[in-house]
Interface confidence: medium
């Protein structure tokens, strides 16, 4: 049929939760492409009716919520003008019984992310929640070892969980709750994280540092494509992600439709005791609505933004 | 000009103790890693231990073959270098080397490299 | 632990001659390799850093090149006080370690 095929990581999830997965792969999702996910070579595609348990919502596909008989390889297609391409994700689907004592507590499955704390230092913890517009997040509750965290050494802050003056203590089973809701209908999900503790000090403690954008503006003229690089400096061992957005929005989902700005794929270099990542913004075709807009790289707890502004007229051309 | 002198080598019995010391001088010492190299007679250059700079928390890593035996540190209102060798062998008989690192870190560029070698302090281990 | 592997081990070169040196990493050290020059009953110098950066006060004739696990020491027109023995040292991770050494002499 003429796909190229890709094969991404296996994803192990938990029964009875709201998951999704994304079919990006940029740069081929960075054009006018189109996306239709499949289950286990199948020739029908995955139903895009919102009430389905299993549908495809744009280009994700969410599940609402995981059954065990989910399990298999799922494909997503995309195809541009041009091209065809083919992921495979392998979904692993297992019982959770979070705090089932009984089984010990916290199973230890390679879903659960681990993160770790810098002792000493104020730090934190980040709820990893990926799912599609349509599905709305509440507030994120946080246990250890099945016990609601509360203490004033603790904040909920959006999707993370800042920790100050971090103990050995701290180490252990974690677990974020949320309550996602789709078309009235509410759902749980909960994330379990192994958390270590760890002396050493990476360059200026654990929070990554953004080399490029410096809160800035550029010059660009109207209609020109632009590319620019976000350049963070992190630990090895850190957990954040990299990002850009607009409008507190991930760019490729603030211009979902048009794919007129996109995230590119992000690459490292790997240094002796700390990592440079690169992940680049492209605008295809600046337009005036982008002028005066901050674009804000994101790396964990930093941030850094540019503004794009149009160039100065040169009055030598009159 | 950047200087580094190494002292505290001699003739020790296996399972005897010894303490190297190196002066530093012509650089800001709490901005530089520190190094100790060995050579053995006639053998290759051996990485022995590092420790960071300030910037890094002074944190320090041993090869295996020190590791629970040779303690690095620094005093730097000293810019000395020290390396305390516990329970010696004879396979640590060599010259031992202060080096600088010139590890530089502003948060983008790094260069790895061992920049300036003090000229060397022999440690014979023999009974 | 990454091991350095340097060959030769003797290269034997007249003078005015050109001279490659090899290193090889067991395993990916981007472009974390340096080189050194020891002379007889002398520390080692610094020669090349980051793979082809020459070091402060070193010839124009010496040039080094690679990335990843292969990496070469070039010297292009051999002078007599080049004669001696070259390390290469990978230092991506811990435990910073060097090749065996490759000792240049005079043919």
């Known amino acids: 049929d003429g796909c190229k095929d890709i094969f991404m990581k296996n994803e192990i999830l938990s029964a009875s939760q709201p998951f999704a997965f994304n079919c990006t792969f940029p740069p081929i999702t960075s054009g006018e492409v189109s996306v239709t996910w499949y289950k286990n070579s199948s020739k029908i595609p995955v139903s895009k009716i919102i009430q389905s348990r299993i549908h495809q919502d744009e280009t994700w596909i969410l599940f609402l919520p995981m059954e065990w008989g989910d399990s298999g390889v799922y494909q997503c297609v995309i195809k541009g003008r041009d091209s065809c391409h083919r992921i495979h994700v392998n979904l692993t689907v297992f019982e959770k019984h979070w705090c089932d004592t009984s089984i010990g507590g916290l199973p230890n499955l390679s879903d659960e992310y681990k993160q770790i704390l810098h002792l000493g230092k104020d730090d934190s913890l980040t709820c990893h929640l990926h799912f599609p517009k349509s599905c709305v997040l509440g507030p994120i509750k946080w246990y250890k070892d099945c016990n609601e965290i509360k203490g004033e050494r603790f904040t909920v802050l959006e999707t993370r969980l800042l920790v100050s003056n971090v103990s050995a203590e701290d180490r252990g089973n974690y677990a974020c709750q949320a309550i996602l809701t789709h078309s009235g209908k509410q759902y749980e999900v909960l994330n379990g994280i192994t958390v270590s503790i760890t002396e050493r000090a990476g360059y200026g403690g654990s929070v990554p540092k953004i080399i490029y954008p410096k809160n800035h503006s550029i010059e660009v003229q109207l209609g020109t494509t632009l590319i620019v690089d976000c350049n963070v400096t992190d630990t090895k061992d850190n957990t954040n992600l990299r990002c850009w957005r607009v409008n507190n929005t991930l760019v490729d989902d603030y211009y979902d439709e048009s794919k007129r700005i996109r995230e590119g794929v992000e690459t490292h270099v790997s240094f002796r005791e700390h990592n440079l990542y690169t992940v680049n913004i492209t605008f295809l075709e600046v337009k005036m609505e982008d002028y005066g807009l901050p674009f804000m790289c994101h790396a964990g707890v930093s941030t850094a933004y540019i503004i794009l502004q149009l160039p100065a007229p040169d009055f030598r051309a009159y | 000009q950047v200087q580094l002198q190494e002292s505290g080598g001699g003739l020790v019995k296996p399972g005897g103790s010894l303490r190297l010391s190196c002066a530093a001088s012509?650089?800001?010492?709490?901005?530089?890693?520190m190094n100790w190299i060995r050579q053995a007679p006639g053998k290759g250059l051996e990485w022995v231990s590092l420790?960071?700079?300030?910037?890094?928390?002074?944190?320090?890593y041993y090869a295996d073959s020190v590791k629970g035996r040779f303690t690095i540190s620094r005093d730097n209102a000293k810019s000395s270098l020290y390396l305390q060798m516990n329970s010696l062998r004879a396979e640590d008989t060599a010259v031992y080397y202060c080096?600088?690192?010139?590890?530089?870190?502003?948060?983008?560029?790094?260069?790895?490299?061992?920049?300036?070698w003090g000229q060397g302090t022999l440690v014979t281990v023999s009974s | 632990e990454i091991v350095m592997t340097q060959s030769p081990a003797t290269l034997s070169v007249s003078p005015g001659e050109r001279a490659t040196l090899s290193c090889r990493a067991s395993q990916n050290i981007n472009i974390w390799l340096s080189w050194y020059q020891q002379k007889p009953g002398q520390a080692p110098r610094l020669f090349i850093y980051?793979?082809?950066n020459l070091h402060t006060g070193v010839p124009a004739r010496f040039s080094g090149s690679g990335s990843g696990t292969e990496f070469t020491l070039t010297i292009s027109s051999l002078q007599s006080e080049d004669f001696a023995v070259y390390y290469c040292?990978?230092?991506?991770?811990?435990?910073?370690?060097f090749g065996q050494g490759t000792k240049l002499e005079i043919k």
């Open positions: 012509g650089f800001a010492f709490t901005d530089y890693y």
């Open positions: 080096v600088r690192d010139m590890t530089i870190y502003d948060g983008y560029y790094v260069d790895y490299a061992l920049d300036y």
């Open positions: 420790i960071r700079n300030k910037a890094a928390g002074y944190t320090i």
């Open positions: 040292l990978q230092s991506q991770s811990y435990p910073l370690t």
């Open positions: 980051k793979a082809s």
